[in-house]
């Protein structure tokens, strides 16, 4: 069906009017472009209210919509092959008669993420509550429709017409009809303002009787920002009525002859207009030209006006609207500059923070501060930065290079750095004997002891560890049998390191080699066991191919 | 969780078509735009377009002249991709893409992609 | 259509060295609409960086991305043997999506 019944509300500069009918989003915004309109904007909670209104005037006319949950077109749109974009108020939709990107908004939930598709955006409406002034109608996105396939529950749309100006409504100062035709093609009889370039048809007296007079006018721009009806004098007066019929039409105070004629007047302070009803201020200021936040002054003698703007705004070219200035032009920041509506604000790259000498000044953040340290070990303020470093025997580790990793020298890219046995440990290492082999004065070497196959020389006591300075007490250590003294061959047993209790002791299990007694020459690989914390240190499986045992209380692959 | 599923390797003659399937499981199917990019042996990779399935509506890789065809079944959750008057140079593997809960076409999901093989 | 060049076409660094990738536009791009995808041999591309400088879920923070206009960026600052792999740009600012000719990071 096409656009049925319609509802109008002409307010500011502007005319809204609603429409019932299932129709297209393309199809409404024809209809409303046929009259020279477009569909609606929605661009401040001032706005919603006005078609607020105008779509209430519609349901009161209309019998019954046939959705409880009604959608009207509205001019917001999102073109086919545009996303969806959130960081927007109107997430990438736009007018569709132009114009720039508004901050208000009114989203009825989260939108659909598409690009593909042309979007359009309804109001909807729950016709079951009443339409409040603080429950303006949420703004729904969907496919725009087609001939015969509008979408679901879409119920009609709303137009809007814009104009440079309005004329009042005319004022009767007796029995009469007046009937405004608008540009756009809407007949109306009650009109708040009435737009430019329409007609009023007044037809005075009761109806009834034949000496009906009829009066034509048209809403003209008499001079700039200017608009009235080219009418002198109340219409329709009647000596009948006096001043009691409609205050005969006058804007203020009504005067009445003796002979039944009656005249208009203005109170203190105001004048009469040349259409010799409407009263006007004879201040400038009262009838606020200023717009966007800018206060009228008056000129001297009360004669003109300028307007002037609040901080952080300046006049546009009108003079009489105020804009935003971008204070950031001037770079009053040290590093980062914000415009922001009224003023500005500064802000800090990462690495700094607001402060030191002057406005809008940065200081380094001092991340190696107590308590906000983000190294595990040392760490270095540097400007913006920091760096981390690890004490000795530890590099640096982890993603973001903060953590610190134990080395371990049993492995070292340098070989290894005992004569037999090595021992990992955090931070540190130390070495060990095969049987029959004792630890020399330096730690590193063995030298023959006597001749028994007793249990290996462990972790030495605290006195004997040969710890770099700053390590800390091993809490895991892997036996690595590297070089057997005097040229024996190496053997390297690769081993895992099972999850242990912390409290675990560090221990020594008996090691028995298939050697002649003592004789270093010759001595079979040695394969390492770990003792699993529940049970304690144990006699490693395999007999006689065995070597020192160990609790081992660090995690796997981690120290 | 999201997942994409394509239909197996394909081998077809010159002239003839190939209609490759992508099953969506783990979201909403009509929620989300079902894109298709193809990768040419030892090539980069090509967008050759895609399709809404709440609304049927299409954008197409000109490249393709025609060619190929996108369409959805809502009922089972299946994207098609249908590709006509196949020559050598359409040996590729075609992936089916979208997007997800990220904005600005950043293909977050990937089907496995299907071989065609154009031979004669 | 915008054409995407990536450079260089193959960089072989050893482990541990900083990787930077170039991807130049034919003409400006929105920062928004320029993405990044990791594809492994025999493995379908996944999404490494979007919208410039967000990496995706599951992606190690060494990767970083970078860039506005026409010139973007993707930095791998300390390589590890599994970021072998070609790395491709994509944009898009109207149809066709374009993707860039990829970069072959190999271990050295």
């Known amino acids: 069906t096409g656009a049925d019944t319609e509802a109008v509300v002409c307010v500011g500069t502007a005319c809204y009017t609603a429409h019932s009918g299932k129709l297209s989003a393309a199809e409404a915004q024809n209809h409303c472009n046929q009259n020279g309109g477009n569909l609606a904007t929605v661009k401040s909670k001032e706005e919603a209210q006005h078609v607020q209104r105008v779509l209430a005037q519609l349901l009161r006319r209309e019998a019954a919509l046939t959705a409880r949950m009604s959608k009207f077109w509205i001019g917001l749109q999102r073109e086919k092959g545009k996303c969806l974009d959130p960081s927007l108020p109107l997430k990438g939709f736009s007018w569709v008669g132009g114009g720039e990107d508004t901050p208000y908004s009114n989203w009825h939930k989260e939108l659909r993420n598409s690009c593909i598709s042309k979007r359009c955006v309804s109001l909807l409406l729950d016709l079951s509550q009443p339409l409040l002034p603080s429950r303006l109608p949420k703004w729904s996105e969907g496919p725009c429709g087609s001939p015969g396939s509008p979408g679901s529950n879409i119920e009609g749309f709303v137009c809007k017409f814009s104009f440079k100006g309005m004329c009042r409504p005319l004022a009767l100062g007796g029995p009469g009809q007046v009937t405004y035709t608008t540009p756009f093609q809407t007949t109306s009889s009650s009109l708040e303002a009435v737009p430019f370039a329409s007609a009023a048809n007044v037809a005075c007296g009761e109806g009834d009787k034949d000496e009906t007079q009829s009066h034509y006018f048209l809403c003209k721009e008499k001079a700039p920002d200017v608009f009235d009806w080219g009418s002198s004098g109340p219409l329709c007066v009647s000596p009948k009525y006096g001043c009691n019929f409609n205050n005969g039409g006058c804007h203020q105070d009504c005067f009445e002859g003796g002979d039944g004629s009656f005249l208009c007047g203005c109170r203190p302070g105001f004048r009469l207009l040349d259409d010799l009803v409407t009263c006007a201020s004879r201040n400038p200021c009262s009838s606020s030209p200023c717009r966007g936040g800018a206060t009228c002054v008056l000129g001297p003698h009360g004669k003109n006006y300028t307007c002037r703007c609040p901080q952080g705004y300046q006049l546009d070219s009108s003079q009489l609207d105020c804009v935003d200035v971008d204070e950031c032009q001037d770079s009053p920041c040290a590093q980062e500059c914000v415009n922001t509506p009224g003023g500005f604000r500064c802000e800090c790259w990462v690495g700094y923070e607001p402060g030191g000498p002057g406005e809008g000044a940065c200081q380094d953040v001092d991340e190696c501060a107590l308590g906000r340290s983000p190294c595990a070990q040392g760490c270095t303020n540097t400007d913006g930065s920091f760096h981390c470093s690890c004490e000795e025997g530890y590099v640096l580790a982890g993603e973001d290079g903060t953590q610190c990793q134990d080395v371990d020298e049993c492995v070292g890219p340098g070989g290894p750095l005992c004569d037999s046995l090595c021992f990992n440990t955090q931070g540190s290492f130390h070495c060990g004997c095969l049987p029959g082999w004792v630890l020399a004065p330096n730690g590193v070497s063995c030298t023959m002891g006597p001749v028994s196959l007793g249990p290996p020389s462990g972790p030495p006591d605290e006195e004997d560890k040969g710890e770099k300075e700053g390590s800390t007490v091993p809490r895991a250590a892997t036996a690595s049998p590297t070089r057997g003294p005097e040229g024996t061959p190496k053997a390297t047993p690769t081993t895992s390191r099972p999850s242990l209790s912390s409290d675990a002791p560090i221990t020594s299990a008996p090691l028995k080699m298939l050697a002649p007694s003592g004789s270093p020459g010759v001595w079979r690989e040695p394969s390492i066991h770990h003792a699993t914390a529940a049970s304690g240190p144990q006699e490693p499986a395999g007999g006689d191919s065995s070597v020192a045992t160990q609790n081992n209380d660090g995690t796997d692959g981690q120290k | 969780q999201v997942q994409l599923v394509q239909s197996g390797a394909e081998v077809k003659k010159p002239g003839a078509s190939v209609k490759v399937s992508c099953k969506a499981s783990?979201?909403?199917?009509?929620?989300?735009?079902m894109h298709w990019v193809r990768q040419a042996p030892g090539q980069g990779l090509e967008w050759m377009g895609g399709?809404?399935?709440?609304?049927?509506?299409?954008a197409y890789n000109q490249n393709f002249k025609g060619r190929v065809t996108m369409t959805t079944d809502t009922s089972t959750s299946t994207a098609y991709m249908e590709l006509r008057s196949l020559t050598s140079d359409d040996t590729a593997v075609y992936y089916c893409?979208?997007?997800?809960?990220?904005?600005?076409?950043?293909?977050?999901?990937w089907g496995q992609g299907t071989s065609v093989t154009v031979s004669s | 259509e915008i054409v995407l060049t990536q450079s260089p076409a193959t960089l072989s660094l050893s482990p541990g060295e900083r990787a930077t990738l170039s991807c130049r536009a034919s003409?400006?791009?929105?920062?928004?609409?320029l993405h990044w995808y990791q594809q492994k041999s025999g493995a379908s591309p996944r999404l490494l960086i979007y919208?410039?400088?967000n990496l995706a879920f599951g992606i190690p923070a060494r990767f970083s991305g970078s860039g506005s206009g026409t010139d973007y960026t993707l930095t791998i600052s300390s390589l590890e043997a599994e970021d072998v792999a070609v790395y491709y740009c994509?944009?898009?600012?109207?149809?066709?999506?374009?993707f860039g000719g990829g970069t072959k990071v190999e271990i050295k």
């Open positions: 893409t979208n997007y997800g809960n990220l904005y600005y076409y950043a293909m977050d999901y």
């Open positions: 783990g979201y909403t199917f009509t929620d989300y735009e």
């Open positions: 399709i809404d399935p709440e609304t049927g509506d299409t």
């Open positions: 003409s400006s791009v929105s920062s928004s609409y």
């Open positions: 919208s410039t400088s």
């Open positions: 994509q944009q898009y600012s109207g149809y066709p999506l374009t």
